[in-house]
C-alpha cells in the first residue's frame, strides 16, 4: 500500500531537489569513469560535490555506494584499502601547527559501518585534502527509469541490465512494486501501479516478470521475480505514477483548455495560487496541455482543493514542473485565489464545438525526448488516470 506523505516533506520546492528528497539514499556520485558505475567517488556537501577521501575508503563503503547507485556490488579490485599509513612529515624544530590550513581544506569521507547505504554517513574534513581519492568500479551497470509519462516520476518502468534498457511485465504488478520504483528514483511513493498500454509500449527486451516486492526493498532488482519470459509482450509493460510527479488539468471551463488550474501532486488534485500566476506560467501550461497559448488569466475563485502550489516560469519551459515551484500544504495562499487560465485553443474563444487542436490522434511533446500519444479529447491530460 502507498506510504503516507512523510510529515517533514509537506513544504517542498524544486530548489530543494539537490537536498535529501523522498527516497534518496546517499549523496554520492561517480565521475570520470568508463560508465555511471565506475569512477572517482564524490559526495555532496551542501551545494558542492567534493571528492571522497581515499585513505578511509574501504570495501564496505565501496559496496554501499555501488548498491545505492543500482550498480550491483563492488568489484574486488576496488575494495583494496591503501596498504600503508600515510606517514607524517618529520617535525621541524619550532615548527608551528599546520592543522588549521589542513582542516579548512580537508576532504570528506564516506564512512560505513556495513555494506548498506543506511549504515553510511558523510564526515566532513575527515582527511587531508592532498591525500588519495576514493575510486570504485562496480560489478553491474544497473539502472532504473520511468519513461513516456511526462516526467522522471511517471511512465513505463524500464531497467538497464547487461547494457540494455528493457521493460517489466505487468503480471502481478501492484502498488508495492511501484512503491519500490518510486522510492528508488527519489520520486516519493506510488500513487498508481499501471498495467500495459497506459504508456507507449517499450521496444527492448523484457527484463522481469512476476515481480513481487514487499515494498521494503531498496531496489527493484532486489524484489522476487522471474526473468522476462517470451510470452510477455510489450502490451503488458508495467507502469507507475509516483507522488512527486506533477500533471495538470483545467476545470470548470467550456472545455479542457479553459478553467481553474489544478495540479495532481502527491496523490491529490491541488489548486495553484494566483498570487504568482503570471503570463509566463499560463503560457507554459497552455502549451504543455496542447491548448495553444495563453490568452487571458481570468479572476480566480476561492480555493476548494487541498494543497497550495506556486510556480515561477520564464516562459520557455516545456512543463510547469520544469519551472521553479513551491508546494505549501500547511497554509492557505495568503490573500490569493485559485489561478485560472483561458488558452487560445478553447472553444469559448472560437465558438466552435471542438477545440482547435484535432481530436484525433496527436502527439504532445512534453520533454526534450519524451512524447505522449493521446487518442481522444477526453483523455488529453499529461497523466492518464
Amino acid at each position: 500500500h502507498p506510504s503516507p506523505a512523510p510529515p517533514d516533506q509537506l513544504n517542498t520546492s524544486s530548489a530543494e531537489s539537490e537536498l535529501w528528497e523522498p527516497g534518496e539514499r546517499l549523496p554520492v556520485r561517480l565521475t570520470n569513469g568508463s560508465s555511471s558505475c565506475s569512477g572517482t567517488v564524490e559526495v555532496r556537501l551542501e551545494a558542492s560535490w567534493e571528492p571522497a577521501c581515499g585513505a578511509l575508503w574501504d570495501s564496505r563503503a565501496a559496496e554501499a555506494v555501488c548498491r545505492a547507485l543500482g550498480c550491483g556490488g563492488a568489484e574486488a579490485a576496488s575494495q583494496l584499502a591503501p596498504p600503508t599509513p600515510e606517514l607524517p612529515p618529520p617535525p621541524a624544530a619550532g615548527n608551528t601547527s599546520v592543522a588549521a590550513n589542513a582542516t579548512l581544506a580537508g576532504a570528506p569521507a564516506l564512512l560505513c559501518s556495513g555494506a548498506e547505504w543506511r549504515l553510511c554517513e558523510v564526515v566532513e574534513h575527515a582527511c587531508r585534502s592532498d591525500g588519495r581519492r576514493a575510486r570504485v568500479t562496480c560489478a553491474e551497470n544497473r539502472a532504473l527509469r520511468l519513461v513516456d509519462g511526462g516526467g522522471a516520476c511517471a511512465g513505463r518502468v524500464e531497467m538497464l541490465e547487461h547494457g540494455e534498457w528493457g521493460s517489466v511485465c505487468d503480471d502481478t504488478w501492484d502498488l508495492e512494486d511501484a512503491h519500490v520504483v518510486c522510492r528508488q528514483l527519489g520520486c516519493g511513493w506510488a500513487v498508481q501501479a499501471l498495467p500495459g498500454l497506459h504508456f507507449t509500449p517499450g521496444r527492448g527486451p523484457i527484463h522481469r516478470d512476476q515481480v513481487n516486492c514487499s515494498g521494503a526493498e531498496a531496489y527493484l532488482w532486489d524484489c522476487p521475480g522471474l526473468p522476462g519470459q517470451h510470452y510477455c509482450g510489450h502490451k503488458e509493460d508495467a507502469g507507475a505514477v509516483c507522488s512527486e510527479h506533477q500533471s495538470w488539468r483545467l476545470t470548470g471551463g467550456a472545455d479542457r483548455c479553459e478553467g481553474q488550474v489544478e495540479v495532481h501532486f502527491r496523490g491529490v488534485w491541488n489548486t495553484v495560487c494566483d498570487s504568482e500566476w503570471y503570463p509566463s506560467e499560463a503560457k507554459v501550461l497552455c502549451q504543455s496541455l496542447g491548448c495553444g497559448t495563453a490568452v487571458e488569466r481570468p479572476k480566480g475563485l476561492p480555493h476548494s482543493l487541498s494543497g497550495r502550489m506556486y510556480y515561477s516560469c520564464n516562459g520557455e519551459e516545456l512543463t510547469l514542473s520544469n519551472c521553479s515551484w513551491r508546494f505549501n500544504n500547511s497554509n492557505l495562499c495568503s490573500q490569493s485565489l485559485a489561478a485560472r487560465v483561458l488558452c487560445s485553443a478553447s472553444r469559448s474563444l472560437h465558438n466552435l464545438s471542438t477545440p482547435e487542436v484535432p481530436a484525433s490522434v496527436q502527439t504532445v511533446t512534453i520533454e526534450s525526448s519524451v512524447t505522449v500519444k493521446i487518442e481522444n479529447k477526453e483523455s488529453r491530460e499529461l497523466m492518464l488516470l
Partner: nanobody, 123 residues
C-alpha cells in the same frame, strides 16, 4: 615521535559513567586527527570514536552512538572520551590513537597507538 598516554580507566557499574583522557607529548598535537579503539578480552581491536584536527568533525561506532562523546583540547594536548550509560559489553582496554593523514577510523591510517587503559563494567 608522539607519545600517547591514556588515563581514567577503572571499574564502574552498569549504567555508570567514566571519562578517559589521553595526553600527548607532541607540540604539534593539533596536526593529528585522534581517536579511540578498544579491545575486549579474546576479541579483535575495534574502532570506537574519532575526531578531526580541530574537533569540528566526529565519528562514532554504531555501538556507542548517543552514549559516548569524543572531544579534544588542543591547548592542553589532551583527548577525551566521555562514556555514559556503560554496559558490560563496553568492558575492554581502550587505546588512544593518532593519525596524520585522516581521522583514525581504519587501522591502516593510524600512525601512533597508546598503551591502553582498562575499563571494566561490572556489578
Amino acid at each position: 615521535q608522539v607519545q600517547l598516554v591514556e588515563s581514567g580507566g577503572g571499574l564502574v557499574q552498569p549504567g555508570g559513567s567514566l571519562r578517559l583522557s589521553c595526553s600527548a607529548s607532541e607540540r604539534t598535537f593539533s596536526d593529528y586527527a585522534l581517536g579511540w579503539f578498544r579491545q575486549a578480552p579474546g576479541k579483535e581491536r575495534e574502532f570506537v570514536a574519532a575526531i578531526n584536527w580541530v574537533g569540528g568533525s566526529t565519528y562514532y561506532a554504531d555501538s556507542v552512538k548517543g552514549r559516548f562523546t569524543i572531544s579534544r583540547d588542543n591547548s592542553k594536548n589532551t583527548l577525551y572520551l566521555q562514556m555514559n550509560s556503560l554496559r558490560a559489553e563496553d568492558t575492554a582496554v581502550y587505546f588512544c590513537v593518532a593519525s596524520w593523514g585522516a581521522m583514525p577510523v581504519l587501522t591502516h591510517v593510524i600512525n601512533y597507538w597508546g598503551k591502553g587503559t582498562l575499563v571494566t563494567v561490572s556489578s
